[in-house]
Interface confidence: low
């Protein structure tokens, strides 16, 4: 009869830039040798060759040199394919053809995903607001995939659906930047929240802006910064917003602007005597010179690192003087967890197994939850460790020890508390012998 080829029913979800394993297995008969095996991976729709094994040899990748087999496991029937540095363009169906004497095939779907950044909120106009004024609030979230769902609500949690325009634009990597614009008439004051949902990762990123329309007091320069921390992904650029209201006839020659670290008072960047004095912070900062005259004293911090996290103070002096501090919260998404099983074969009900859930290069420290196939939390016999690398990013390893029932599914959820990003992995264990760790 035909050879039975097994692949996961559910799509394999992979984060952009990470590696994905497309699982495929067959049951070799006694006396099977790799010389008999023909294995072909191809794109289901176009039939484009991806990787092959024939005549006892790995024929290599035909797909941008980003694929690999598991040569040591082929003889046990593991025909899985490793796809490295996943891109949006990789999304789709891959077919695994196995031929020995008989032949069989099965298709596995790859679903690509990327978490959306915490939304940034901008307001236009952003000063001298009065109840009854119409304002435009823009919510922007970047570099996610697939397209997001966007929800707006007011401070009472009532959904705002009228006067919302949402656009999503893919960049050259296929990742989407989402910009959602809400037009509202101000009441006495109001909070407006924007929630950007990644439907595949079931990741919600949200931000809110509170508008209190009233005239600023006279006297000291009023310096305005966001109340909420600015959240920036490691390696991206962050804007620490700071603004003041220039009076008529204001010129940049009058302006003294100093950015410094709030705690240590270390100088970060300055503008004095009518000139940008440049970065005093590892040459990674910049002002917006064309916008200074309009009162925009914001600071651009490039290639954000974990060590940048903390409070930055914006000092503005014209004739009067004012200052305000803005917090930078650094974050990095956790990778989709990989699941390993020990022991991983000849399992029987009553055996004690150790399931390890590993997720990499996130920040800050993760929260880890385990649950069984019925959704019941598993809290006993869990040991979680988190280790920071030299960049300050955490690798999390959570170990669950369980006694097997007849069969069972065990899920691990790694949550980034700042990005509100959940990364899930699960493993299903049946009472049958297994020859390699199942992938989530």
């Amino acid at each position: 009869g035909a050879l039975e080829v097994q692949v996961p029913e559910d799509p394999v979800v992979a984060l952009v830039g990470t590696d994905a394993t497309l699982c495929c297995s067959f049951s070799p008969e006694p006396g099977f040798s790799l010389a008999q095996l023909n294995l072909i991976w191809q794109l289901t729709d176009t039939k484009q060759l991806v990787h092959s094994f024939a005549e006892g040899q790995d024929q290599g990748s035909a797909y941008a040199n980003r694929t690999a087999l598991f040569p040591d496991l082929l003889a046990q029937g593991n025909a899985s394919l490793r796809l490295q540095r996943v891109r949006v363009a990789d999304e789709g169906s891959f077919t695994c053809f196995v031929s020995i004497r008989d032949f069989g095939s099965a298709a596995v779907s790859l679903q690509v995903a990327a978490p959306y950044s915490k939304p940034s909120m901008t307001l236009e106009p952003n000063k001298d607001l009065r109840p009854g004024d119409t304002v435009t609030i823009t919510c922007s979230s970047y570099q996610g995939y697939p397209e997001a769902e966007v929800f707006w609500q007011d401070g009472q949690g009532v959904p705002l659906t009228g006067n919302v325009t949402t656009s999503q634009m893919a960049n050259e990597q296929g990742l989407f930047d989402v910009h959602s614009i809400l037009r509202v008439v101000l009441g006495a004051n109001g909070t407006y929240s924007c929630l950007v949902r990644n439907p595949v990762l079931q990741q919600d990123a949200h931000s809110s802006v509170t508008i209190t329309p009233q005239r600023s007091p006279t006297g000291a320069v009023e310096v305005q910064v966001p109340e909420d921390p600015v959240v920036a992904l490691v390696g991206t650029d962050a804007t620490l917003r700071c603004s003041f209201s220039p009076e008529p006839g204001f010129s940049l020659a009058q302006l003294n602007l100093i950015w410094q670290l709030t705690d240590t008072k270390q100088l970060v960047h300055s503008f004095t005597e009518g000139r940008d004095q440049g970065s005093a912070y590892a040459n990674r900062t910049a002002l917006f010179p064309d916008l200074l005259a309009q009162g925009n004293a914001s600071l651009r911090l490039q290639r954000v690192r974990v060590a940048d996290e903390g409070s930055f103070t914006c000092f503005v002096s014209i004739r009067d003087f004012g200052s305000a501090a803005v917090s930078l919260q650094v974050a990095a998404p956790y990778s989709k967890p990989s699941m390993t099983l020990e022991p991983n074969k000849d399992l029987r009900p009553g055996d004690t197994v150790t399931i390890t859930c590993s997720s990499y290069r996130g920040y800050p420290e993760a929260e880890v939850f385990w649950q069984d196939g019925q959704g019941v939390p598993l809290t006993g016999n869990v040991t979680t460790s988190q280790m920071a690398n030299e960049q300050g990013l955490f690798d999390v390893h959570s170990v669950l020890r369980v006694v097997l029932g007849a069969n069972g599914t065990y899920s691990c959820l790694v949550r980034n508390p700042v990005l509100q990003q959940d990364a899930h992995g699960s493993v299903t264990i049946t009472g049958q012998p297994m020859t390699f760790p199942p992938e989530a």
Partner: antibody, heavy 119, light 113 residues
Framework: EVQLVESGGGLVKPGGSLKLSCAVS????????MSWVRQTPEKRLEWVAS???????FYSDSLKGRFTISRDNSGNILYLQMSSLRSEDTAMYFC?????????????WGAGTTVTVSS | DIVMTQAPLSLPVSLGDQASISCRSS???????????LHWYLQKPGQSPKLLIY???NRFSGVPDRFSGSGSGTDFTLKISRVEAEDLGVYFC??????????FGGGTKLEIK
Amino acid sequence: EVQLVESGGGLVKPGGSLKLSCAVSGFTFSSYAMSWVRQTPEKRLEWVASITDGGITFYSDSLKGRFTISRDNSGNILYLQMSSLRSEDTAMYFCARGSITTDWYFDVWGAGTTVTVSS
Amino acid sequence: DIVMTQAPLSLPVSLGDQASISCRSSQSLVHSNGNTYLHWYLQKPGQSPKLLIYKVSNRFSGVPDRFSGSGSGTDFTLKISRVEAEDLGVYFCSQSTHVPPYTFGGGTKLEIK
């Protein structure tokens, strides 16, 4: 043991207000989405509102801003503030726990508290 | 909003018989992530609802294996293979694919013939 215990129901006149509470024990409250669901005298179930573990709130459109869901993670209490009450708000109000994932099924329910709106 | 329609309204059965309850949605409940968020609850007389089945066919913790869920798209079925006295009550289906709002069916009352 996982427990949800609602309180605060009672008889109120149309236009009045009421605040329901749901005291939670036996699990990490701050890790779960929570919801209010009501059952009408005709025994129909109606979803009222939900609040995620991150504090994002969702409401039934028909409530038009009259109800507010909130949570106190330190005190393990879920609230539902109801104002401008109408006769059609008469129901048994249940608090319910969402799954720890975002699948939005309700795996634990309280016994309910009765709200009667009548003049 | 998604409308959930259950049939029959009332289902008289004899103990030991098989029972089957239908639930139909006004739109497909297949989410863009491939999952189908259709759930079943049982409310016994004088009690609050209890989760039986989540995501079409997954039995919740402690639910006997005589309960099974099936279906796809817009048509779903809850089957009880051998009805026992403790199974009597009102069964509700619900969907959480298209939320908000979370919507429930009108209920099916399982009673003794």
